[in-house]
Interface confidence: low
């Protein structure tokens, strides 16, 4: 059956889009490149502005296969740098601590609850 508007805000479809398109530098065609570029920038802004990471949290980038994981090995970037706590210059407060998962240096809240929360309350 056709997907409804609400379906696109369910965690699974939201997660699927993020995993497939975020930082996907090897798309099959130009149309996909446009979408991937848009998805990447949207997620970057979302994670930076809302101080969140992934759909459910940083573990999304560890548990699932993703374009991001294909492009970045786990030791260097367990999750995108946008998941790190930033200073006023939008640079990671402590990149190494963020990569190591030291509490206070990365955002452990998923973005889905921040986006869906206000919608679900109406």
């Amino acid at each position: 059956t056709a997907a409804t508007q609400q379906d696109f805000f369910t965690p699974n479809l939201f997660l699927k889009q993020m995993l497939e398109r975020y930082q996907n530098n090897s798309p099959p065609n130009n149309d996909d490149q446009w979408k991937n570029n848009g998805v990447t920038k949207t997620w970057d802004r979302l994670m930076l502005q809302d101080n969140c990471c992934g759909v459910n949290g940083p573990s999304d980038w560890q548990k699932y296969t993703s374009a991001f994981r294909t492009e970045n090995n786990d030791a260097d970037y367990p999750w995108p740098r946008q998941c790190c706590v930033m200073n006023n210059l939008k640079e990671p407060l402590n990149l190494e601590a963020c990569k190591l998962g030291v509490p206070g240096f990365y955002h452990n809240q998923g973005c889905y609850e921040l986006i869906s929360g206000p919608m679900n309350r109406h």
Epitope: N25, N30, Q33, W34, N37, G38, D76
Partner: antibody, heavy 118, light 113 residues
Framework: QVLLQQSGPQLVRPGASVKISCKAS????????IHWVKQRPGQGLEWIGM????????SFNQKFKDKATLTVDKSSSTAYMQLSSPTSEDSAVYYC???????????WGQGATLTVSS | DIVMTQSPSSLAMSVGQKVTMNCKSS????????????LAWYQQKPGQSPKLLVY???TRESGVPDRFIGSGSGTDFTLTITSVQAEDLADYFC?????????FGAGTKLELK
């Protein structure tokens, strides 16, 4: 096919602002960064900066930060570079080129010759 | 800034000879995330715009003759033309796109004897 068509040669007086255009066709304009490169005879190639047509985000070589202004018109799939207060040092061939994210330049414009002379 | 040092600045070769030119970067161009070297080689014929030959240091661009071979990793890179042809008369230069500002080698001018 992919084509980056640049504006023709220009002769300008020192101090008079100049704008060079780069019209893209044959691909999704907002999917690739547009770069600008300067080439002076016997002086090699210099990267000026780049612009992301999807949101007009720019990144510059600090050397050209106060010299070049990069803009795009998405409706016509055209990128522009404006050079302020040109001097004879700005006389060169200027190329536009495209890249996908931080990848190589796979297509280049034919070059636009700028001559600054009184 | 990453400095790209290209050598030699010029060389004269006869048709059929093997040509080797080098590019050395002031820092590594190897992205440890994907094990790719962010270096490309271009050919520029007189009066023309540059043409992509090789990217990621060793991947030949589609349509480029297989006599053009890119090699190297880290800071040292080589472009080899296994059997030079008359139409290969041109300037060749490398580009690093590992970090901004993007920087080019000064170029190698290939002339025919």
């Amino acid at each position: 096919q992919v084509l980056l068509q640049q504006s023709g040669p220009q002769l300008v007086r020192p101090g008079a602002s100049v704008k060079i255009s780069c019209k893209a066709s044959g691909y999704s304009f907002t999917s690739y960064w547009i770069h600008w490169v300067k080439q002076r005879p016997g002086q090699g190639l210099e990267w000026i900066g780049m612009i992301d047509p999807s949101d007009s985000e720019t990144s510059f070589n600090q050397k050209f930060k106060d010299k070049a202004t990069l803009t795009v018109d998405k409706s016509s799939s055209t990128a522009y570079m404006q050079l302020s207060s040109p001097t004879s040092e700005d006389s060169a061939v200027y190329y536009c080129a495209r890249s996908y994210y931080a990848s190589r330049f796979d297509y280049w414009g034919q070059g636009a010759t700028l001559t600054v002379s009184s | 800034d990453i400095v790209m040092t290209q050598s030699p600045s010029s060389l004269a070769m006869s048709v059929g000879q093997k040509v080797t030119m080098n590019c050395k970067s002031s820092q590594s161009l190897l992205n440890s995330n994907n094990q790719k070297n962010y270096l490309a080689w271009y050919q520029q014929k007189p009066g023309q715009s540059p043409k992509l030959l090789v990217y990621f240091a060793s991947t030949r661009e589609s349509g480029v003759p297989d006599r053009f071979i890119g090699s190297g990793s880290g800071t040292d890179f080589t472009l080899t033309i296994t059997s030079v042809q008359a139409e290969d008369l041109a300037d060749y230069f490398c580009l690093q796109h590992y970090g901004t500002p993007l920087t080019f080698g000064a170029g190698t001018k290939l002339e025919l004897k």
